[in-house]
């Protein structure tokens, strides 16, 4: 029944209490005011309302705050946070780390990764800084979430998070995301040297610019061909034969097996034949 019914006389509540459990759904829809709910979220969470009833309350709150919930309400959501979608959260404006931490506690162990990501993203967007508790909460979420943040949000992620990123965590990241994450990784690993540095930075190399790759070639990284193939074509094609030689080190011979495939083929096309000949691998540009 989609027709909006009027609230029966005397049924309009002044407080949130157990009596509301016995209201029919249409009565809740007609009688309960969104601002009443917003002011008494602690009671909404305390009283054992059904999932359906809670859905009606959410609908009422959404109608009261069409531009997104105010932070005063968000802070009080408690377990009601579980009924909020990532799309809802994206409309919020959260500035307090306390608000974030309160909701993170609620979401713990609840399979709410998407909501947590959206919440942290919206906090970052408002200029928030990630404290230890927030970072700890993010630790429990697969790091592919980094690709779900907007590029602007990524800037606010502390470089320390880069230490946790695994080999395939960034597979669905856009080029722009990877570029930002590469810079963060460089900053995170700046005090790491030699082979350990390369092992760490390797995951992020899809975001390395031509200049980054040239700089990397100065550090004896001995890049394997599998990693080389994941580099941006645009970054790769501008590298000289000497730079690629320094980048690959002892793996330079593996170019031969990949010469007909992108990005090796694209790189070969941009080189002078005499320079390729100097490698002694029989590569054709």
């Amino acid at each position: 029944d989609t027709e909006q019914k009027a609230c029966p006389p005397g049924k309009e509540p002044n407080v949130v209490d157990e009596n509301l459990i016995f209201y029919q759904n249409w009565e809740l829809e007609a009688c309960v005011d969104g601002t009443l709910l917003a002011g008494q979220m602690d009671l909404v969470n305390e009283i054992p309302f059904t999932y359906e009833q809670l859905s009606i309350f959410k609908h009422k709150l959404d109608k009261t705050y069409p531009q997104g919930y105010p932070e005063s309400l968000i802070k009080q959501l408690g377990h009601f946070f579980r009924y909020v979608s990532p799309e809802d959260i994206r409309q919020w404006n959260v500035t307090s780390p306390d608000t974030v931490n309160t909701l993170l506690k609620v979401s713990k162990g609840q399979k709410m990764d998407a909501q947590v990501i959206a919440l942290v993203a919206c906090y970052l967007r408002g200029g928030g800084k990630l404290d230890e508790d927030i970072v700890k909460a993010l630790d429990n979420i697969p790091l592919s979430y980094l690709c779900d943040f907007s590029p602007q949000d990524l800037h606010a992620i502390p470089s320390s998070v880069m230490w946790l990123v695994g080999l395939h965590d960034l597979d669905k990241c856009s080029q722009r995301h990877l570029g930002i994450l590469y810079q963060k990784a460089c900053s995170a690993f700046q005090n790491v040297s030699g082979l350990e540095y390369f092992e760490k930075i390797r995951t992020f190399l899809g975001g390395a610019s031509r200049e980054d790759l040239r700089a990397l070639s100065q550090h004896n990284v001995s890049m394997d061909i599998a990693t080389f193939k994941k580099l941006q074509v645009d970054a790769l094609v501008g590298l000289s034969v000497a730079e690629v030689q320094k980048l690959l080190g002892p793996h330079i011979g593996d170019l031969k097996t990949e010469e007909d495939k992108s990005p090796v083929r694209d790189w070969l096309f941009r080189q002078q034949q005499k320079d390729l000949d100097s490698l002694g691998l029989g590569l054709q540009g």
Epitope: E211, A215, A242, G249, S278
Partner: antibody
């Protein structure tokens, strides 16, 4: 034809500063790492600084770190070396060189810097 | 830092002679060894890179060999224009370092 022309050398007192310039032509300047290499009178060659093609990365040996700053202006095809807190042992001919991966493939004619009171 | 040691420091030879200059690195530099030629009052010029590859325009009488720590520059038949000082340089590891030079003089 690749051409590198250094300028800005001269006599400077110990503790003083000097800025060298290197005008590049005959190649796409913004595509290459660039370096400064020096040679004290009657002595061998010493690498002084390298800068990445976009200017993001810079490299120095310990002997000049913190005193010398390499920079570049790709819109002017020019490389710079700002030298501060100069010492007598910095007296040398300073060469600007194009760097490719692991070697210096083209060099300028050099500019003499003399540090003396 | 990697130390580069050239020998001899100087040598006297005649036109047509075969000349060999050696360069030793204090640690393994793979094949990232380059040779430069410098004439008095002039800038150095790249002769050979990656141990044995001739830079463009360099005559074939120049050749290089070696690997790891020991390297050689050979001039098969010395010409009048080859009298100069020769420097080796390692490009394997920062900081890049040069040998002290070998002066090739006319006997």
């Amino acid at each position: 034809e690749v051409q590198l022309v250094e300028s800005g050398g001269g006599l400077v007192q110990p503790g003083g500063s000097l800025r060298l310039s290197c005008a590049a032509s005959g190649f796409t300047f913004s595509d290459y790492f660039m370096s400064w290499v020096r040679q004290a009178p009657g002595k061998g060659l010493e690498w002084v600084a390298t800068i990445s093609n976009g200017g993001t990365y810079t490299y120095y040996p310990d002997s000049v770190k913190g005193r010398f700053t390499i920079s570049r202006d790709n819109s002017k095809n020019t490389l710079y070396l700002q030298m501060n807190s100069l010492r007598a042992e910095d007296t040398a001919v300073y060469y600007c060189a194009r760097f490719d991966g692991y070697y210096f493939d083209y060099w300028g004619q050099g500019t003499l810097v003399t540090v003396s009171s | 830092d990697i130390q580069m040691t050239q020998s001899p420091s100087s040598l006297s030879a005649s036109v047509g002679d075969r000349v060999t200059i050696t360069c030793r690195a204090s640690q393994d530099i793979s094949n990232y060894l380059n040779w430069y030629q410098q004439k008095p009052g002039k800038a150095p010029k790249l002769l050979i890179y990656y141990t044995s590859r001739l830079h463009s325009g360099v005559p074939s009488r120049f050749s290089g060999s070696g690997s790891g720590t020991d390297f050689t520059l050979t001039i098969s038949s010395l010409q009048p224009e080859d009298f100069a000082t020769y420097y080796c340089q390692q490009g394997n590891t920062l900081p890049y370092t040069f040998g002290q030079g070998t002066k090739v003089e006319i006997k």
